[in-house]
Amino acid sequence: LTCLGGFASPGPVPPSTALRELIEELVNITQNQKAPLCNGSMVWSINLTAGMYCAALESLINVSGCSAIYRTQRILHGLCPHKVSAGQFSSLHVRDTKIEVAQFVKDLLLHLKKLFREGQFN
């Protein structure tokens, strides 16, 4: 189980709810968006496999000063079972490939929707 929302959270949030919340937030920040997200910041690409939430957080946590993804980072914190800090890298990063935050978010979103449809919430 994961806990989202910081001190305001009433209790543990089921993974399916957390995943829905993440999907909805990623849609919010990308809908009809053509301007570069986070001023075109680049992040490490990740393998969209097991451990993806932590890997995604490890990539996005290195983007600073971008309010558009603050809530995404917070939701990912709730979905990742261990503490993640800037500069941390897991084997799930494709270390030789950097992509724009906007593309990273869109790729992540499409994959999360696929997982949700397949009922893979963890």
Partner: antibody, heavy 126, light 108 residues
């Protein structure tokens, strides 16, 4: 065949209510964001509101003139979109179209595809 | 509330290039969509995401966007292109749609 068919239009008195339906076929309705757009006689197109697909949150947004009076909903099991219109005003008189929402096209499986209904006329008059 | 501004009318001779503009403060960051509507018919999408053309739309239709202005260009306009054209986009949140007032294209 990909199509949308609206129904439920007609004559209603000011202050009255009406529910429009839009039956979808030929595409994966549950993946689509859907919009309602209206056109008053001899006037331009006016965006009424939209509903996201369920997987994208199912959230609704409305244009200022209809917010609080109109409600958009969907029944994916019936491939049907609805527009519940309450507290109708004479200025709501228009042809109402349902359409796939292009902003949501990236998230669905209808990217670059455009589907509109034939429109249904709603007349608000005493 | 957010608005998109279009010229009420544009006239060209057959074979000429017609340009219809659409201005809006959010257009630098939000995509524009263009619809063609002929009398008594439902609108038809002719350009999406600023410059992409749906299948079945003739190549003479193209779109571009720069700053707060989106432009629909019809190269070698034909009589059958005579119609009302509407630009469509969203406010800066992406949550609320808006249409321009429409431009009547006359090809004579």
């Amino acid at each position: 065949e990909v199509q949308l068919v609206e129904s439920g239009g007609g004559l209603v008195k000011p202050g009255g209510s009406l529910r429009l339906s839009c039956a979808a076929s030929g595409f994966t309705f549950s993946n689509a964001w859907m919009s309602w757009v209206r056109q008053a006689p001899g006037k331009g197109l006016e965006w009424v509101g939209r509903i996201r697909s369920e997987i994208d949150g199912g959230t609704t947004n409305y244009a200022a003139p209809v917010k609080g009076r109109f409600t958009i909903s969907r029944d994916d099991s019936k491939n049907t979109l609805y527009l519940q219109m309450n507290s109708l005003k004479t200025e709501d008189t228009a042809v109402y179209y349902c359409a796939t929402d292009q902003v949501g096209a990236y998230y669905g499986d209808y990217y670059g595809m455009d589907v509109w209904g034939q429109g249904t006329l709603v007349t608000v008059s005493s | 509330s957010y608005e998109l501004t279009q010229p009420p009318s544009v006239s060209v001779s057959p074979g000429q290039t017609a340009r219809i503009t659409c201005s809006g403060d959010a257009l630098p960051e939000k995509y524009a969509y263009w619809y063609q509507q002929k009398s008594g018919q439902a609108p038809v999408l002719v350009i999406y995401e600023d410059s992409k053309r749906p299948s079945g739309i003739p190549e003479r239709f193209s779109g571009s966007s720069s700053g707060t202005m989106a432009t629909l260009t019809i190269s070698g306009a034909q009589v059958e292109d005579e119609a009302d054209y509407y630009c469509h986009s969203t406010d800066s949140s992406g949550n609320h749609g808006v249409f321009g007032g429409g431009t009547k294209l006359t090809v004579l």
